[in-house]
Amino acid sequence: IVLRPSRVHNSEENTMRALTLKDILNGTFSYKTFFPNWISGQEYLHQSADNNIVLYNIETGQSYTILSNRTMKSVNASNYGLSPDRQFVYLESDYSKLWRYSYTATYYIYDLSNGEFVRGNELPRPIQYLCWSPVGSKLAYVYQNNIYLKQRPGDPPFQITFNGRENKIFNGIPDWVYEEEMLATKYALWWSPNGKFLAYAEFNDTDIPVIAYSYYGDEQYPRTINIPYPKAGAKNPVVRIFIIDTTYPAYVGPQEVPVPAMIASSDYYFSWLTWVTDERVCLQWLKRVQNVSVLSICDFREDWQTWDCPKTQEHIEESRTGWAGGFFVSTPVFSYDAISYYKIFSDKDGYKHIHYIKDTVENAIQITSGKWEAINIFRVTQDSLFYSSNEFEEYPGRRNIYRISIGSYPPSKKCVTCHLRKERCQYYTASFSDYAKYYALVCYGPGIPISTLHDGRTDQEIKILEENKELENALKNIQLPKEEIKKLEVDEITLWYKMILPPQFDRSKKYPLLIQVYGGPCSQSVRSVFAVNWISYLASKEGMVIALVDGRGTAFQGDKLLYAVYRKLGVYEVEDQITAVRKFIEMGFIDEKRIAIWGWSYGGYVSSLALASGTGLFKCGIAVAPVSSWEYYASVYTERFMGLPTKDDNLEHYKNSTVMARAEYFRNVDYLLIHGTADDNVHFQNSAQIAKALVNAQVDFQAMWYSDQNHGLSGLSTNHLYTHMTHFLKQCFSLSD
């Protein structure tokens, strides 16, 4: 299926040009999305192009500015947040990135009713996290690893925690591993629905081994960055959950929420917290061996001012074939009775589906079913449940939004997005207003992305929020590559692939092939989304065919494929890339003497192992910031898929699956190894060990390091990186410069 029909007519051909590397590096063909910042059922805020904060009322059709760009500029604000009582706005400036989600910033509070900044009892700086209560204008914030509370922005703060200490005790914010591998947020505190209580996590990293690396900077001596970072098998953070009454915070102080007995008996993780009502909270816990998860519903006991988590309100989710959940254990979406909930987990056939849990997990009512997967529950109202899945036309790499009517019996299902802009839009997400009165749909492709506003009752489109007209015009004279998404059936395994073909592709000719791989557990590379990126340029200008293949271990096609890699990382992911390459050669248009593979992070690991597979298929390849041994990576991620690196568990495969063990096999390939020296995620250690093993084996290779760059290799490093990789590939494929 050709997803991007060529608009080229012969008469136009001479005015069309190929993509250039400069186009990609300049972001010339980047797109915009529009996510409303909902503040009620029918109102949302949006930051205009000229930096005013504008309130839109869908029902009145009116909009007006609530905060001028002049006020924003006065404190160099780049972000804002309106208090739910509509009296104040926090303005965020001096953004300073820390890890993937975390950053510090300076915060100013602007009083909208009086048109001035709040003076007196100003916030300290820099703040690690700040948020309004869901009702009114209480503020919770984290400063120097401690949590503070303000009843009103101008009030003095009440200090909730006192034991916070850099790299030791984290209150209300996650440590490195919880941020990256468990919570995927910069915060670890949660207001109850009406702001009565504040729940927070405390992470104790006292006993965690520290990763230390040099940050060269500009000084005479480099700095040393120290991060408590548990690698596979190491001591993990100790987590505790507390809840404090924010109306009378000094009365009883923070109350700890008890951990379920079956979880507390050995090492465990806290995985998420969901408030149900002001006096009911749901916590999710996970054993360190991540195939058992417990969902615990706890109630406030007014008489004792404590939280009670009866065993009858514990729900166990266990996997017998792999780990619990997909990438993360799914979170519950509670219904209006405040006890039953909807949740995605594997059905008896091994497909992730929505289930309704009223009393026990064993008695769960399955809401969706089929040989496809439910991916996200967006919203549950009194009469509808909105979710996304890849059911439509059996393409796993699509996302459509569905509505199930739960108010009627039997429930009826409607695809909201399937036929809206069928050619242009096959991959959606959604954002709902209060009570799902209205919602925004954001379509990511395969055509040019478009964001639209819809009526929550009728699903009628109200207006286009962003259609990327400038991008559409800019692409009119560009020869974009053709893209197709198809599947291979090999030994009862379905391998979906995306092929990116040069604009004047001719099946009778031979083309160099570049495999782009990620391949990590529960990932998906073959998606029906729009992108004009480096590989688009390689196809458009340099005449390469690029292929992405989702092999075993990838997501949204059932547990058989997903859990195939359990305890065996680095085997089937590589095999499936190789199998796909052989199939591509059979198609007749690939020059089998010019095949390369490249990947980043997990993809760097897979590309390295593929190059060292001894098949002779690959002429060259690139690994950017690769994992080289699972003993070097984070405990939470690694052990989920590999178990522990101990003799009585899975040490043998930890040792067998390293890149270093295959150093000899790199002798007959051209290998480019790239890594940032300040990579907090996949440590430079990984590439240092590959390089050492190759040197010891006397194998020639190429390498590039990026000083003081992290896992993202951003800024000027990005330009250097893609220019360098382009030269390497062109040389490998004997393409003239």
């Epitope: 009620s40 059922g41 029902e59 048109g115």
Partner: nanobody, 117 residues
Framework: QVQLQESGGGLVQAGGSLRLSCAAS????????MGWYRQAPGKRRELVAF???????YYTDSVKGRFTISTENDKNTVYLQMNSLKPEDTAVYYC???????????WGQGTQVTVSS
Amino acid sequence: QVQLQESGGGLVQAGGSLRLSCAASRSIFSIGTMGWYRQAPGKRRELVAFITVDHNTYYTDSVKGRFTISTENDKNTVYLQMNSLKPEDTAVYYCNRAPPSTDGDRWGQGTQVTVSS
């Protein structure tokens, strides 16, 4: 731009009631979320209550259960029914959009409410 005119204030004893009115130059429905604000002597103006076009309401903690905000769309009017008044409710009361606009809408004169003990 919207013109707003507040009325209905006065002197009342503690425990008494007042009903404030706010007349708008056009349909309340077309304006959007409307709020009642107040400013006590020497204090900053604060939002007391607001009402959205679908009649969801919000009240500041100190007036919950005593004040009621409502609209009469055909009369282009927003009301604030104030019961069980306390001396600390003494202030000039204003109506405006919630949050206020910076696009040139002006605050009205307000209406004085005085609660004696």
